[in-house]
Interface confidence: low
């Protein structure tokens, strides 16, 4: 029967060439000589000469190694004519399918991938996705199926398995608790992509994971006790600068301090503002103090941040003893 099933040819064949693939055979050859020919891209049109046919025997020949990544399938036509040039068969479809060999390594789409994740997140939180491509076939073979893995992590704090990577999607996730920006602001992961679903060629890239700040450190007064002296009747007078330390990212809402007078200011004599650069609390008099009425005020000031705490943190409190100094006032008649 003048029909041919698809021919499967591995790429990168070593020959020897020409290599016989299959035989075209017409049953009209009884009593008459038949000549065979092929047409189509790869035969008589570009890329010409990849395939040929033995005119008389009908053997289909491969003249050179194939590259699946260049052309994965050839569609040719087989022809059979008699000695006088008359067609004895209709043109026959010949499909040549180039089968894959694992001749390409995976390639990461970037040398360095960058991602970020908030400190303190729970295990399972997704950080970023890395991608490697492989020109080999991933549908019918595992040659182009890439498996991802983490080769190393720097630094190894608090331990060396802070992240995991999904072997097939390349999604990097947090696997352990303990991400702390104040200790490790950035991790460098050496990631690997291995074809043959993990059993083949390997390539590496770097994934840089930036640990973003969360408000997990409370501002702390240092010192916690202050003594100040203020002349009576002075309004807008700077009484004391209160100093706090906060380990969160400087100049961020998680670092910027908010001060509140919690107690000791029944007469609403004092106010406190935050210095925008030093983050200090500047305690000033809102209205004049009266030595004769009260010569000492004990204030209790609490400090928090502009941003809410992400976990329950103890708030720091400072005590300020304000001594009111007597001013010689004109007598009242």
């Amino acid at each position: 029967e003048w029909v041919m099933p698809p021919i499967f040819v591995p790429e990168n064949g070593k020959g020897p060439f020409p290599q016989r693939l299959n035989q075209l055979k017409s049953n009209k050859d009884r009593g008459t000589k038949i000549f065979y020919s092929i047409t189509g891209p790869g035969a008589d049109s570009p890329p010409e000469g990849v395939f040929a046919v033995e005119k008389e025997t009908g053997w289909l020949l491969l003249n050179k190694p194939l590259d699946r990544e260049e052309i994965a399938k050839y569609e040719l036509f087989g022809h059979a004519v008699s000695e006088n040039g008359a067609s004895v068969e209709d043109p026959m479809n010949i499909s040549i399918i180039v089968t894959d060999q694992n001749d390409h390594k995976p390639k990461f789409t970037q040398d360095t991938f960058r991602g970020s994740v908030l400190e303190g997140v729970l295990p399972g939180t997704s950080v970023m996705q890395v991608t490697a491509t492989d020109e080999d076939d991933a549908i019918y073979t595992y040659n182009g199926v890439v498996a991802y893995s983490i080769h190393s992590q720097e630094p190894k704090d608090p331990h060396d398995l802070m992240f995991t990577i999904h072997r097939s999607t390349g999604t990097i996730s947090v696997i352990s608790s303990g991400l702390d920006r104040e200790k490790v602001p950035e991790y460098t992961l050496t990631i690997q992509a291995t074809d043959m679903d993990g059993d083949g060629s390997t390539t590496t890239a770097v994934a840089v994971v930036e640990i973003l700040d969360a408000n997990d450190n409370a501002p702390m007064f240092d010192p916690q006790k202050y003594e100040a002296h203020v002349p009576e009747n002075a309004v807008g007078h700077e009484v004391q600068r209160l100093t706090v330390t906060d380990l969160d990212a400087p100049n961020s809402p998680a670092w910027r301090a908010t001060y509140l007078i919690m107690g000791g200011d029944d007469g609403d004599h004092f106010t406190i503002t935050t210095h925008p650069e030093s983050n200090q609390g500047i305690l000033t008099t809102r209205k004049g103090l009266d030595f004769e009425a009260k010569n000492q005020h004990t204030l209790y000031v609490e400090v928090t941040n502009e941003a809410p705490f992400v976990l329950k943190l103890p708030t720091s409190t400072a005590t300020i003893v304000v001594h009111v100094e007597d001013v010689n006032e004109a007598p009242v008649f």
Epitope: R114, R181, P185, E210, L212, D213, T245, A249, P250, N251, S252, W255, E277, S278
Partner: antibody, heavy 121, light 107 residues
Framework: VQLVEQSGAELVKPGASVKISCKAS????????MNWVKQRPGKGLEWIGR????????KYNGKFKGKATLTADKSSSTAYMQLSTLTSEDSAVYFC??????????????WGQGTSVTVSS | ELQMTQSPASLSASVGETVTITCRLS??????LAWYRQKEGESPQLLVY???TLAEGVPSRFSGSGSGTQFSLKINSLQPEDFGNYYC?????????FGAGTKLEIK
């Protein structure tokens, strides 16, 4: 390879303005701060300000507010600094320098080669 | 504004010697201090950040230390390429400020 390439030397007249550029390559331009630093001949380094190309946020040294204007073009990975109403005090070499984000935690790790600005009539 | 005092202003030393440059600040900047070297006609090069972390490609003969308001940069076994101007820089709060510099010369 991370590179920061600056525009060439400028000779400008007093009272004029000048705009110098800094083209970045080899890193994520949009997500790193670009700083500008002034150096007068034979003198030390003076921080002018910085810009975050991702959203255009700027921070200036108070001393240079009104003098320097920082901009960035993400499509060309280029940062710009315009200096206005130039005087002889503005004659200096101006450097751009990358600083990785987050907050102010990182130092300036990649520097341009510097652009010399000479103010003279 | 934060004041930075870098000392000495200049220093003469021979190849193979060990030198130390110090930087004192008027306010606590924790560990956020960087050191740069600038050779004549070149741009500054980051040597150390976060007080003691060596930048990529910087030889181990350089070491940084200190925190708060007092910092130092130590260079062991000076090499010819180490000569130039050294600057400390606050990378903690605005404005980022640089020390006045230390000129390290060959004796």
């Amino acid at each position: 390879v991370q590179l920061v390439e600056q525009s060439g030397a400028e000779l400008v007249k007093p009272g004029a303005s000048v705009k110098i550029s800094c083209k970045a390559s080899g890193y994520a331009f949009s997500s790193s701060w670009m700083n500008w630093v002034k150096q007068r001949p034979g003198k030390g380094l003076e921080w002018i300000g910085r810009i975050y190309p991702g959203d255009g946020e700027t921070k200036y040294n108070g001393k240079f507010k009104g003098k320097a204007t920082l901009t960035a073009d993400k499509s060309s990975s280029t940062a710009y600094m315009q200096l206005s109403t130039l005087t002889s005090e503005d004659s200096a070499v101006y450097f751009c320098a990358r600083q990785r984000d987050y907050g102010a935690l990182y130092a300036m790790d990649y520097w341009g080669q510097g652009t010399s600005v000479t103010v003279s009539s | 504004e934060l004041q930075m005092t870098q000392s000495p202003a200049s220093l003469s030393a021979s190849v193979g010697e060990t030198v130390t440059i110090t930087c004192r600040l008027s306010e606590n900047i924790y560990s956020y201090l960087a050191w740069y070297r600038q050779k004549e006609g070149e741009s500054p090069q980051l040597l150390v950040y976060n007080s003691k972390t060596l930048a990529e490609g910087v030889p181990s003969r350089f070491s940084g230390s200190g925190s708060g308001t007092q910092f130092s940069l130590k260079i062991n076994s000076l090499q010819p390429e180490d000569f130039g101007n050294y600057y400390c820089q606050n990378h903690y709060g605005f404005p980022f400020t640089f020390g006045a510099g230390t000129k390290l010369e060959i004796k």
